[in-house]
């Protein structure tokens, strides 16, 4: 049995809209159905309808179709907002251009090329003919409109009202001539709905015949309307998935507009001093990468051959050797003048100040009701009502729906680190918003820091100085490699996740990094049997000011005798003073004949007040920090083991309670180390692990 074609692609959808007839003479037909697709099929075939169907409304609440012989452009009709309604109008009746020979044209042009008025199809005056509406059902030979019922060369035509001229073609442009784009069409929002080879585009809100990630509700600013050609991913020009099961996608034939004929509404905001979002609109003159190496000119092929040329990226301002982001990378970058370093990121360019006026929140922001709808990295928030399923997955109560309006930043899950929102980016399902706590707000998010209220247990290169070589297997210890050299430590907290410090990432190019697991020697000597080398697939930066990064591995680590995970503490817990803990690290350790083995230094927990005294009152610790002092003078972390763990034991369970970060001195006698308190960020860590997709092994 031949599969009936899905005709919903032939309709233009207007969400939350219905049509109200002012003229009572206009007919409509209704019927209960399950889907809008069923309505569309019946409308297209006019099956069982006493009129030519030009549009329909699908009532989602009542599961009902309303078929109309009119559309929103007809007289005697008005549009009305309605949450439960979606209006679908047959494109053929609202299109003012033709595709191919114009066989499907059903517009209202009724004048020929030379300006003669058309003769009505039902009339035999002045010209007798056999093109009767009754003989050409479905060809819409209505009134005196230009039509091409037989699909002849030359396009739509009509018999003319001039007795001297029997028939003439009408001057209706090809849609490909009407439609135009600027640059590579990223801001194109036109109505082209077929590819350059004539294939009909698949609707963006459909997953057949091709499954895809570009869901309209996930990407509200990409213009994924109906089945129109778009360029959401920086391709050379707009494209679409096709209805041909054998052709997944194809480009669309849209010409470039003559200068200044189009308003580019969606071009990224241009900045010259700082980066907004991913920096696609950065037009400044920084021309070195993060470490000072100069950039190669974009129009040069030396020392690096490439095809990211000004000709290929006409609107990306690839001038001189300035840092740019023509391809949707994480941030502006360039090819470098060092033959050994192909690409470098210009991460020294500051982010534009994203704080929005006086917007601020109190406590943890659970009552924040402002209208900011952008994440700290500049991504547009996606609508809460499209993400309720995801929200329910990680909270165990019913969120207050009255607060979750539109796509505004909110805190429905009582996150300790402030308002956040879901994004339209599948790689970054959610992120925090750039709102600060209100000045003077001292509401703590965790109380009684120095008293054991909650138990922690659930049932220059940084190095450990003067530590003891470890002989026991510490399988959760990770050596983060940058361009094949050890740069930082880290802790494996889940098969696909490493907890480390944000200072460990001088470049934004993830290809520069690897994680080595199961090793004891920093060079991997003698560890061949137990070593696992894994690529890095994503960095998730911690809440503002945390200095933490969760590093996602490209594939899960295999847990064995040499590689294991370490537990996280309970959120907001405190560990008793004098608890014995350890820090771990590789690198130069103050010994001339350093052997490259993993070292451990033993420390003990110190309360924040006492810690501050040891720092002569120059340091005030807050709820996000934990302090540990050395049992042995001059033993502790130093520049190079950043990202490594402070590990403590409680109730026979070892946990990572702190992360080593720079800026607090290096193994100074009587000067305890200050670490990032993992317990303060435990909920954030669990939320990331729960909500970010990881590769399956």
């Amino acid at each position: 049995q031949r599969k009936r074609r899905n005709t919903i692609h032939e309709f233009k959808k207007s969400a939350k809209t219905t049509l109200i007839k002012i003229d009572p003479a206009l007919k409509i037909k209704t019927k209960k159905v399950n889907t809008a697709d069923q309505c569309a099929n019946r409308c297209t075939r006019n099956k069982g309808l006493p009129f030519t169907c030009k549009a329909f409304v699908f009532d989602k609440a009542r599961k009902q179709c309303l078929w109309f012989p009119f559309n929103s452009m007809s007289s005697g009709v008005k549009k009305e907002f309605g949450h439960e309604f979606d209006l679908y109008e047959n494109k053929d009746y609202i299109r003012n251009c033709i595709i191919g020979k114009g066989r499907s044209y059903k517009g209202t042009v009724s004048i020929t090329k030379s300006g003669i008025k058309c003769q009505p199809w039902s009339s035999m005056i002045p010209h007798e003919h056999s093109f009767l509406p009754s003989s050409y059902r479905g060809k819409d030979l209505q009134e005196n409109y230009c039509r091409n019922p037989r699909g002849e060369e030359g396009g739509p035509w009509c018999f003319t009202s001039n007795p001297e001229v029997r028939y003439e073609v009408c001057d209706i442009p090809q849609c490909s001539e009407v439609e135009c784009m600027t640059c590579n069409g990223e801001s194109y929002r036109g109505l082209m709905d077929h590819t350059e080879s004539g294939k009909i585009c698949q609707r963006w809100d459909h997953q057949t015949p091709h499954r895809h990630k570009f869901l309209p509700e996930r990407y509200p600013d990409k213009g994924f309307d109906d089945n129109y050609c778009r360029n959401p991913d920086g391709q050379p020009r707009p494209w679409c998935y096709t209805l041909d099961p054998h052709t997944r996608w194809e480009y669309c034939a849209i010409k470039t507009c003559a200068d200044n004929t189009m308003n580019d509404t969606d071009v990224p905001l241009e900045t010259t001093e700082c980066i907004q979002g991913q920096g696609e609109g950065y037009r400044g003159t920084v021309n070195t990468i993060w470490n000072g190496i100069p950039c190669q000119r974009w129009d040069s092929q030396y020392p690096h051959e490439h095809d990211m040329t000004p000709e290929n990226f006409k609107c990306k301002d690839l001038r001189e050797n300035y840092c740019r982001n023509p391809d949707g990378s994480e941030s502006p970058w360039c090819f470098t003048t060092d033959p050994n370093i192909r690409v470098g990121y210009c991460s020294q360019i500051p982010n534009c100040d994203m704080s929005h006026g006086q917007d601020c929140y109190r406590g943890n922001g659970k009552n924040y009701m402002g209208n900011l709808s952008q994440t700290r990295s500049g991504l547009t928030c996606s609508m809460w009502d499209k993400n309720m399923e995801d929200l329910h997955r990680h909270i165990f109560w019913e969120p207050d729906a009255s607060k979750l309006n539109e796509n505004y930043c909110r805190n429905p899950d009582d996150d300790a680190h402030g308002p956040w929102c879901y994004t339209g980016n599948p790689l970054i399902p959610w992120d925090y918003c750039p709102i600060s706590r209100c000045e003077g707000d001292t509401t703590p998010t965790i109380v009684n820091l120095d008293h054991p209220v909650i138990s922690c247990a659930k049932t220059k290169q940084l190095r450990v100085v003067n530590g003891i070589p470890t002989r026991t297997n510490i399988g959760w210890m990770v050596s983060l490699r940058y361009r094949n050299k050890h740069i930082c430590g880290g802790s494996l907290i889940k098969e696909s996740w490493v907890l480390t410090a944000r200072q460990c990432f001088p470049s934004r190019d993830l290809k520069d990094y690897e994680a080595w697991l199961g090793i004891h020697d920093v060079h991997g000597r003698g560890d061949e049997k137990c070593k696992q080398v894994l690529n890095v697939s994503q960095l998730v930066y911690g809440p503002e000011g945390s200095d933490l990064v969760l590093m996602k591995l490209a594939r899960p680590a295999v847990l064995d005798d040499f590689v294991s995970t370490i537990d996280l503490p309970n959120y907001g817990c405190t560990i008793p003073e004098k608890t014995s803990c350890s820090v771990y690290g590789w690198g130069y350790t103050g010994l001339i004949n350093y052997d490259g083995l993993l070292r451990v230094a033993h420390l003990y927990i110190m309360g924040n007040e006492k810690c501050s005294q040891h720092h002569r009152g120059k340091v005030t610790l807050n709820e996000s920090e934990i302090c540990a002092g050395a049992e042995k003078i001059g033993s502790g972390p130093c520049e190079g083991d950043y990202g490594g763990p402070l590990v403590c034991e409680q109730h026979k369970m070892r946990m990572v309670l702190g992360v080593i970060v720079p800026g607090r001195g290096c193994a100074i006698p009587n000067r305890p180390g200050i670490f990032v308190r993992v317990a303060y960020y435990a909920k954030w860590i669990h939320k990331i692990i729960l909500t970010y997709k990881v590769p399956q092994s």
Epitope: Q235, Y251, D307, E311, D327
Partner: nanobody
């Protein structure tokens, strides 16, 4: 997707010439950077030549520079490799490949999303 079909290979005497063609279907080649690669028996695949989309930028491996010329005819959706002064060491299976512009080196075979099956070129002495 893009389907690439090479033709024009064959047996030729040293010093002779051949013109390889790479015809595409499924997409217009004008949007793609096109490369030619070759692999001799028991050897690594090596880069031969490439031509950019959007501009007449070409590059060649040192071993073929001055003897081979890469060109494209967008109207015919075809890329060519004109091979002159052929040597026995040019014997290999020649592949054409297509990619959209990317940060990766155009000499890196793995950066090309679409690849043909190859055509055999044999140069006898």
């Amino acid at each position: 997707e893009v389907q690439l079909v090479e033709s024009g290979g064959g047996l030729v005497q040293a010093g002779g010439s051949l013109r390889l063609s790479c015809a595409a279907s499924g997409r217009t080649l004008s949007d793609y950077t096109m490369g030619w690669f070759r692999q001799a028996p028991g050897k690594e695949r090596e880069f031969v030549a490439r031509i950019n989309t959007g501009g007449p930028i070409t590059s060649y491996s040192d071993s073929v520079k001055g003897r081979f010329t890469i060109s494209r005819d967008n109207a015919k959706n075809t890329v060519y490799l004109q091979m002159n002064s052929l040597k026995p060491e040019d014997t290999a299976v020649y592949n054409c490949a297509a990619r959209l512009p990317t940060k990766m080196s155009p000499r890196d075979y793995s950066s090309y999303a679409y690849r043909g099956q190859g055509t055999q070129v044999t140069v006898s002495s």
